[in-house]
Structures are given as C-alpha cells and as structure tokens.
C-alpha cells in the first residue's frame, strides 16, 4: 500500500531544523500540508501545491518555509528552534484517487550541557562539586582513586526546560586526596564527556 | 503510440460476472492510474474505481457494494475490471482510460455490457 | 456523495457562438473539476483539469473558470465539432461524481 516515509530529527537549540516526508508512490500529490500536532487538534502550518505555491499561515510565518518544494518530497525548515517546536509534524499528501496520504516526523530539542566542577575543603572533609546544565536531564557520575567515598545528587528542573543534575562528592580525609586527579562523568544523549579536577591544598 | 484497447462486448445473465481488460501500450503501465467509469444508455458517466499499478493499490465507488474488483498484470500491462451480481442495470459501456495525477489523456474504445435474462 | 448539477441540460447554439455550461457542486470542491467532452459510441475527451487548465492539444477556445462550488466551461466561438455533449467531474471527495452532462445541438 501506499504509505510516507519519514524520519524523527533532533537538532540544538536556536539552530535550524529540517523535516522531510516522502511519498512512496508513483505519482506526485495534488497539494501537500504541513501540521503541527496538538492535544486537540493539528494545526495547519504550511501547503504547497501547484495552484497556489507556498501558503504560510500566519503563526509560523517568520518561523519556517518549505525547503524542498516537491509533491512527492517535501522538506519543511525551521529557522531557529525553540523548545516550543519540539513536537511532531504530519505531513499530508493529498493524491488523485487515494486521498490523504499522512506521515509523522517528530522534532526533539536538546540542549547540549554546561557543566561546572569545583572543590572546598572544610575542617575535617573535602566537597567537590560538578554541576551540569542540559536538556534532556544529563547523567553525572564519578571516578576516583579508590571506593567507598559517599556521594549525594539533586536534579533541579528549570522553567526554559533544562535540568541541572548537581553531584557533590563527600571525601573525609581530604589529606589523602591532594594532587590526586577526580574526574566528573557527563552523559548526554549517549555521549559520556570527562571533566577532571586535581584537588590542591589552599 | 499511446493505446489502451478493451476486450470485445459480453453479454451477461443477470447474478454472473464480467471481467473486462484493458491493454496498455506505448508508456509505461506502473507510472499512470487506470481508471474505470462507465455509461448506461442514456446516462450520465458514473465512476467505479481506479487502481495505481505501481503498488496495486486500488479504490472503489461504495455504490457498488463490493460488486466491483479492479486488478492489473502488470507483466502484461493489463488493469482488469470485474463486476459481479451482474443486474440489468448494469446494461452499460464501460471505459477505461488513464490519468497522471489528475490529468486524463487516453481511453479504452469501450466495452459495452449486456446483462439480460 | 457530492451531487454535481449542471446546467443547462441542453444547448441550441450556431457555428461561431459563445457558449457557457455551468456546473455546481454540493459542497466546496477546491478546485477539483474537469471538464470532458463525449460524441455519441465514443469514450469521454478530457478538456480542462484543476477548474481552468487546458489539456494538452485543446482548442484555446475551450476555457474552464471557478472556485468553491461553482464552475463554467466557456466555449468563445463554437466550431461544427464542437457539437456534443458535456460532462463535470469533481474528484475533490471520493467518490469522484460526474455531473449530469449537457447536450450541445446545433440550432
């Protein structure tokens, strides 16, 4: 049967993104429109067909095009994303003699993290402290030296839609750790990135 | 040159079958709908279905409650159209004709239909 | 189903008339209309597709114009062949319905 291809994307905030819906299928469409899909009902954004061209409407006018103009393929491109445009996206081929013809390609955003790492020693214990900012929620974890060092984690979720996982390692005799290397784990959409700290006495 | 010829005329009883073909040549079968519409006497135009042959996908007016299967060979770059429980209203000449999209070019010469007991 | 209704049914008209058929559709068809020209034992000729475009090799004569639910194909100076009858078609909703047809004679 007669089906649309398609393939979810995942691009970095406030950089653009492109999806695109293939018609499998030996003739083209007679018009193709782009929805965004809502909890009650999709939202028309974007038609293209041979009698009228591109028709943007209003709301994503300044905030996506068709990229590739094709009644069989068809591209849309956001120009800058932001968190709002996560979602998926129905594109509908409307073909001569079998109808509407839809595919779905979703849109994730991510932002990539920002991660900080510090130490402060007390009297009698060293606190060393990694913090990282992404979107979706990082992973942190630690490697040290040797075992049985007591760490605690608090995940914070912020209005923009990141969340900061912040990971503080409790050492309780600090002397032993000076001049030794601790390293701060960071995973992020598969992605495991070392952050490394040589504890100094101050 | 671009053809599609029909089988020849049938003469049907009412409750058989009648499976038409319609042969084409000149282009290439799977890029083109093949369309069925026919005409009773003195009637207008009435559309059955259509199937795309590059999938076999095929699509059907519901007044015909089933009675209506339309399939291709493409091998033999040949769309067939059957109609079953045949009824004398189904006296008519039926046509086949292709369309790119909704741009219609070339018909079949007709298959005319006679059911009668 | 959507119903089309055209009109008139039939048309006495002379050699270099200008003619109009007028076809209406039940409900908005967007533009989804062909127009089609028959001879009597002959299979349909298709005239113009999408309301207003020419098929390839038509007279410029023969013209298609409309949208929503009303459309006319304008015939600007009627030739001796041109004396047949004429069909709509919508294929905006399935299933694709034809309009009534409306006979061309010569007066």
């Known amino acids: 049967q007669v089906q649309v291809v398609t393939q979810d994307e995942r691009e970095q905030l406030y950089t653009p993104a492109s999806l695109k819906c293939s018609l499998q299928n030996a003739q083209e469409a007679l018009i193709v429109t782009w929805q965004k899909k809502k909890a009650v009902s999709p939202e028309n954004m974007v038609t293209f067909s041979e009698n009228h061209g591109v028709v943007i409407q209003p709301a994503y006018k300044d905030k996506i095009n068709i990229t590739q103009l094709g009644l069989q393929n068809s591209t849309i491109t956001f120009w800058n994303i932001t968190l709002e445009d996560e979602g998926c996206y129905m594109c509908l081929f409307n073909t001569f003699g079998f109808g509407k013809i839809s595919g779905t390609a979703c849109l994730t955003v991510y932002v990539q993290p920002i991660v900080s790492l510090h130490y402060k020693f007390s009297e009698d214990h060293l606190n060393i402290t990694c913090s990282a900012t992404a979107r979706p929620a990082p992973m942190v974890f630690w490697k040290v030296p040797r075992s049985g060092i007591e760490n605690s984690t608090v995940t914070l979720s912020h209005p923009n839609g990141t969340t900061s996982v912040t990971s503080i390692l409790h050492i309780k005799d600090p002397k032993n750790q000076v001049g030794k290397e601790v390293i701060c784990q960071v995973l992020h959409l598969g992605t495991v990135t070392d952050f490394k700290q040589t504890v100094n006495k101050g | 040159q671009v053809q599609l010829v029909q089988s020849g005329a049938e003469v049907k009883k009412p409750g058989a079958s009648v499976k038409v073909s319609c042969k084409a040549s000149?282009?290439?079968?799977?890029?083109?709908?093949i369309l069925w519409v026919r005409q009773a006497p003195g009637q207008r135009l009435e559309w059955m279905g259509h199937?795309?042959?590059?999938?076999?996908?095929?699509n059907y007016n519901l007044k015909f409650k089933g009675r209506v299967t339309i399939t291709r060979d493409t091998s033999a770059s040949t769309a067939y159209m059957e109609l079953s429980s045949l009824r004398s209203e189904d006296t008519a000449v039926y046509y086949c004709?292709?369309?790119?999209?909704?741009?219609?070019?070339?018909w079949g010469q007709g298959t005319l239909v006679t059911v009668s007991s | 189903d959507i119903q089309m209704t055209q009109s008139p049914s039939s048309l006495s008209a002379s050699v270099g008339d200008r003619v109009t058929i007028t076809c209406k559709a039940s409900?908005?068809?967007?533009?989804?209309l062909s127009w089609f020209q028959q001879k009597p034992g002959k299979a349909p000729k298709s005239l113009i597709y999408?309301?207003?475009r020419l098929v390839d090799g038509v007279p410029s004569r023969f013209s298609g114009s409309g949208s929503g639910t009303d459309y006319t194909l304008t015939i600007s100076s009627l030739q001796p062949e041109d004396f047949a009858t004429y069909y709509c078609?919508?294929?905006?909703?399935?299933?694709?319905?034809f309009g009534q047809g409306t006979k061309l004679e010569i007066k």
């Open positions: 004709g292709r369309s790119k999209r909704d741009y219609f070019d070339y």
């Open positions: 000149g282009y290439s079968f799977t890029d083109y709908i």
């Open positions: 199937i795309d042959p590059y999938y076999g996908s095929s």
């Open positions: 409900q908005d068809i967007n533009s989804y």
């Open positions: 999408r309301a207003n």
């Open positions: 078609l919508q294929y905006d909703e399935f299933p694709y319905t």
